[in-house]
Amino acid sequence: SQTLTVCPGSVQPLSSQTLRASSSAGTDPQLLLYRVVRGPQLGRLFHAQQDSTGEALVNFTQAEVYAGNILYEHEMPPEPFWEAHDTLELQLSSPPARDVAATLAVAVSFEAACPQRPSHLWKNKGLWVPEGQRARITVAALDASNLLASVPSPQRSEHDVLFQVTQFPSRGQLLVSEEPLHAGQPHFLQSQLAAGQLVYAHGGGGTQQDGFHFRAHLQGPAGASVAGPQTSEAFAITVRDVNERPPQPQASVPLRLTRGSRAPISRAQLSVVDPDSAPGEIEYEVQRAPHNGFLSLVGGGLGPVTRFTQADVDSGRLAFVANGSSVAGIFQLSMSDGASPPLPMSLAVDILPSAIEVQLRAPLEVPQALGRSSLSQQQLRVVSDREEPEAAYRLIQGPQYGHLLVGGRPTSAFSQFQIDQGEVVFAFTNFSSSHDHFRVLALARGVNASAVVNVTVRALLHVWAGGPWPQGATLRLDPTVLDAGELANRTGSVPRFRLLEGPRHGRVVRVPRARTEPGGSQLVEQFTQQDLEDGRLGLEVGRPEGRAPGPAGDSLTLELWAQGVPPAVASLDFATEPYNAARPYSVALLSVPEAARTEAGKPESSTPTGEPGPMASSPEPAVAKGGFLSFLEAN
């Protein structure tokens, strides 16, 4: 493990660089458990999601370290220091392996570049001065005694810190013991600051910002320059109008965070313009809090806070903890500078879903004759751990055989609202496939998820749905069994069928038109609606092999084509049974099993003929009870 470097007074997550355990077995980081044997002396260790408990952290996992959830918070001591060292003693366990002792070294240093603390000095808070007046700059505002703390204490009294002004104030003057500083005399000492001898005198004529730049470094006995810490910084001077003006609240950006997390409140959420009040003088009070979490102050102890200052906001000490419901909420606040009447303010907090999911309940079915269909919530709907969010969708992989349109225009982006209104349409543009798919990326409340929508074409075809067909017989395939007549009418073309699969027991054949026509039946793989209407097709119904005679099931899978529409796959499912001469079959039989004819005393070939065989009990199809057509598509 490396040393964890922490900026003074700040919070730093433990990282995989500073604390990393692994096992030869490649154990899941969730199962690598650390126990805190001895906690930090200069601060505290806590979990990002359980900060408000105030209890010392006892256990954590390597996975939580990877996630950046284990935080070290340095607590500023009363006495200045330059560098301080802390240690955490840990015990690592991952049964069945033996426990291992681990030590994490922590270095708290003013030397480090700290985004949370731009100054390397113990204090560099700036000064507020009334317009045209003077103010003393004391160690409460500017203090380099942490540089002195780098010198061992026996020699410290012989040292001082020299401040060299590198850029003077433009709207006022710096005085040391009432003597103005200038280019010829640009220095003052930490000891003079501590004695209250440094004064800024404002020259009047406006309330623009002022300040000065300086370099501070250690000075040894008799003014000798010594090696040691040094820094170049600016000291801000805010000139306040002597006429008290009420603070002006600024526009607020809602705070967005996921449920169970914590986020700092910044000036983007809460800020005021008040040239004559210091941030610490602007006080906020919570009048009404939402149910989705609470405000807390870093280092402010347990539970929610109801009062805080602009300085708390500016320094990043104020945070919102989203431990409540997953809904948006608003803090009603009152704000005052202590001189003007309180003003109402609000802070909106929006809880984002920690994850969203695109629900796909069904593929998109496109009616064949239309070649297009509107998407609905059946195809695309976003759900999250809160109410259904308004989602935006973007195509990340478009359909191959069609496109998506909104209002008749091709589009690659659309909203849940447009889906719900039926405005998002998938239309085939290439009529060579009976199915398609496209991939969308859904974005809802800052979180995204992707999904694939499948598209299938629903055949415009009437199919037989009656009783069983006799095994060993040949029945006529005609529009009573398969009928794409409506598709023909809608497209002005002759629909074509292609046999994709089946039947398992039997075959589709072309039959001679009349007895005079030569040749027997020919195996068919493609046919047209015209063939069906002409009665040129037969289905030889086979017997299942290798089992006792009895009822069975079979099917034909067909692809149906017509001009100007996509093809569609449809199936003709039928039941079969041993031939029963006494039963009226609801389809035209072109031939019956040979055995049945022999028993009737008429031995004949079972080659299909153009007319029903003598034993065919239903020369013309009769409609069975309940009908034998089922309409597959309603357009």
Partner: antibody, heavy 112, light 107 residues
Framework: QVQLQESGPGLVKPSQTLSLTCTVS?????????WNWIRQHPGKGLEWIGY???????NYNPSLKSRVTISRDTSKNQFSLKLSSVTAADTAVYYC?????WGQGTLVTVSS | DIQMTQSPSSLSASVGDRVTITCRAS??????LNWYQQKPGKAPKLLIY???SLHSGVPSRFSGSGSGTDFTLTISSLQPEDFATYHC?????????FGQGTKVEIK
């Protein structure tokens, strides 16, 4: 609104490859749906050559398919047309267009 | 391919006239039809999309109608700037195809 601008040589020799580029401004070629090339022979009607979509897939007119390639460069927000083995019959004004807007067109003459 | 046939191929009209141009598809195009206006030496401009939707910035004297295979572009009161060639285009089935154009001239 989206603006499109064609660029490329105005004269191409027979049997060579015609290359044109369309630069899109005011919109991204990864968000509009179709980015088309269309041509118009002198004094004649319009003929669709092909398109590239927001996700980079293509479709070409079957009558030109064997000779056409449409590609894109998302970093430059451009899409391009290459038409190989040109003849005098490929002399035309070539336009790039999305669904709504067209470039001003560029005349390409095929001549030796 | 879907053939698009425009009629008439040219017409003469006066300012203020009502003008109708028709476009017939060789088979149904589900309303996926655009109308464009083209002036000499210029690129076509979209007027109407999806049979009847007016493109932004197009004057309301232009309107579109139709379904199935037969579609119409109507200019309710011809203006001097409307003398141009008008093209229909289907985007129902690939390849996209255009009509041969109708030239509207000053009588």
């Amino acid at each position: 609104q989206v603006q499109l601008q064609e660029s490329g040589p105005g004269l191409v020799k027979p049997s060579q490859t015609l290359s044109l580029t369309c630069t899109v401004s005011g919109g991204s070629i990864t968000s509009g749906y179709y980015w088309n090339w269309i041509r118009q022979h002198p004094g004649k009607g319009l003929e669709w050559i092909g398109y590239i979509t927001y996700d980079g897939s293509n479709n070409y007119n079957p009558s030109l398919k064997s000779r056409v390639t449409i590609s894109r460069d998302t970093s430059k927000n451009q899409f391009s047309l290459k038409l190989s083995s040109v003849t005098a019959a490929d002399t035309a004004v070539y336009y790039c267009a999305d669904f709504d807007y067209w470039g001003q067109g560029t005349l390409v003459t095929v001549s030796s | 391919d879907i053939q698009m046939t425009q009629s008439p191929s040219s017409l003469s009209a006066s300012v203020g006239d009502r003008v109708t141009i028709t476009c017939r598809a060789s088979y149904g195009i589900r309303g996926y039809l655009n109308w464009y206006q083209q002036k000499p030496g210029k690129a076509p401009k979209l007027l109407i999309y999806y049979t009847s939707s007016l493109h932004s910035g197009v004057p309301s004297r232009f309107s579109g109608s139709g379904s199935g295979t037969d579609f119409t572009l109507t200019i309710s009161s011809l203006q001097p700037e409307d003398f141009a060639t008008y093209h229909c285009q289907q985007y129902s089935a690939l390849p996209w195809t255009f009509g041969q154009g109708t030239k509207v001239e000053i009588k």
